[in-house]
Interface confidence: medium
């Protein structure tokens, strides 16, 4: 059902838009998985509204979400990771709206970390390295990474490079000399799992050397 009304206290509930979106994070805390859902309309009155997931769970039929301010959250080992689960918004025992979702198709990886850039003078390049917790995971191991960098003064002029490894080389001649650059990286599932981009890693800032006038190369 799309609406719910009882004794006039929620008679306009059917006019509300209860559409929601969710993402899963697998092995986010040891062997525990998490599922996070939120309403797409930030103005929805969430008082008395609950989320429940049923199906494709191990040992239990359904699980209830915990509410954390405006998001709904589950952390559990009980996700089966096969088939579709039914996720419902409920008031009491009444379902307002439901979605069938395969949790392996809404995976949001953890953000990469330890991003750094090292200048190699002899090679005239910059080696970008970063780390990801997914290298140690059993499930979401294969990721595609998006490295984005820009000259600090160019607000929206990001250059993006997609790669599957955690190491990237930027050629010095492709960058402006004596400039401050900002670089960051995010990840998305590749291969079996599908889903969304992770949050961006914290940005790393680096400066390119000045041009050596005699040779036309950067210092």
């Amino acid at each position: 059902e799309s609406g719910y009304a009882q004794n006039g206290d929620l008679e306009d509930a059917e006019l509300d838009d209860y559409s929601f979106s969710c993402y899963s994070q697998l092995e986010v805390n040891g062997s525990q998985h998490s599922l996070t859902c939120a309403f797409e309309d930030p103005d929805v009155n969430t008082t008395n509204l609950e989320f429940e997931i049923c199906g494709a769970l191990v040992e239990v039929k359904c699980l209830n979400f915990r509410k954390l301010q405006e998001i709904y959250f589950i952390e559990t080992k009980k996700f089966l990771l096969i088939g579709k689960s039914n996720i419902c918004v409920k008031v009491g025992e009444k379902s307002l709206t439901c979605k069938k979702i395969d949790l392996t198709t809404i995976v949001k990886p953890e953000a990469p970390f330890d991003l750094s850039v090292i200048y190699r003078e002899g090679a005239n390049d910059f080696v970008v390295t970063f780390n990801t917790s997914h290298l140690q995971k059993k499930y979401v191991k294969v990721l595609m990474h998006d490295v984005a960098y820009r000259q600090e003064k160019d607000e929206n002029k990001w250059t993006h490079v997609n790669l599957s490894s955690t190491k990237l080389t930027l050629l010095q001649r492709k960058l402006q000399p004596a400039a401050m650059y900002e670089i960051k990286v995010r990840s998305i599932p590749d291969h079996y799992f599908k889903g969304f981009w992770s949050e961006w890693s914290p940005s790393y800032y680096f400066r390119t050397p000045e041009i050596n006038n005699s040779s036309g190369e950067m210092d």
Partner: antibody
Framework: EVQLVESGGGLVQPGRSLRLSCAAS????????MHWVRQAPGKGLEWVSG????????GYADSVKGRFTIFRDNAKNSLYLQMNSLRAEDTALYYC??????????????WGQGTTVTVSS | AIQLTQSPSSLSASVGDRVTITCRAS??????LAWYQQKPGKAPKLLIY???SLESGVPSRFSGSGSGTDFTLTISSLQPEDFATYYC???????????FGQGTRLEIK
Amino acid sequence: EVQLVESGGGLVQPGRSLRLSCAASGFTFDDHAMHWVRQAPGKGLEWVSGISWNSRGIGYADSVKGRFTIFRDNAKNSLYLQMNSLRAEDTALYYCAKDEYSRGYYVLDVWGQGTTVTVSS
Amino acid sequence: AIQLTQSPSSLSASVGDRVTITCRASQGISSALAWYQQKPGKAPKLLIYDASSLESGVPSRFSGSGSGTDFTLTISSLQPEDFATYYCQAFNSYPLWITFGQGTRLEIK
């Protein structure tokens, strides 16, 4: 009524190929993983292969890996098993089975009546 | 892959008897075990899932128990229609596979 009907079995020579089909009705086919299970004459049940609802999760028994291919067509509510390089030991009754993961995990709650594959020269 | 070993392989019993069949997994599988009944010339039928949950329409004389590596199927009072072969089944979701026990044939004494 939930129903699975297998077809495509028959007598085939060793080394040849055969394709089994399973027509599903009475349930939302693309909500469910599907499996092939076989039973050699007078023997027990042997899982052959399984495929997730969206075809991204696929598994095979070691005995058929590299020779058999499972695939599905959700638009036609159909499951298939392409069997290549057939051997005498593949002779069996082949069942198509529906997976009911809402039970908690891979549980085969509906089975077809099976189709017989005989590999002999 | 996990191996399932059923015991006994065959069993003779009389109508009204209480019968227990065991299934041992080579490694822990929590409660992820199902039991099936198969009669000659018929497809298998799901009896128990999640080690102890009774499938809809299955008589209450059937029950399942156990977790980890040791599981049992119990028929509290055998009926004539219960003489069949019984299989336990376990699974893995990633990579995907299913495995069956070798079966226990229950015959009339």
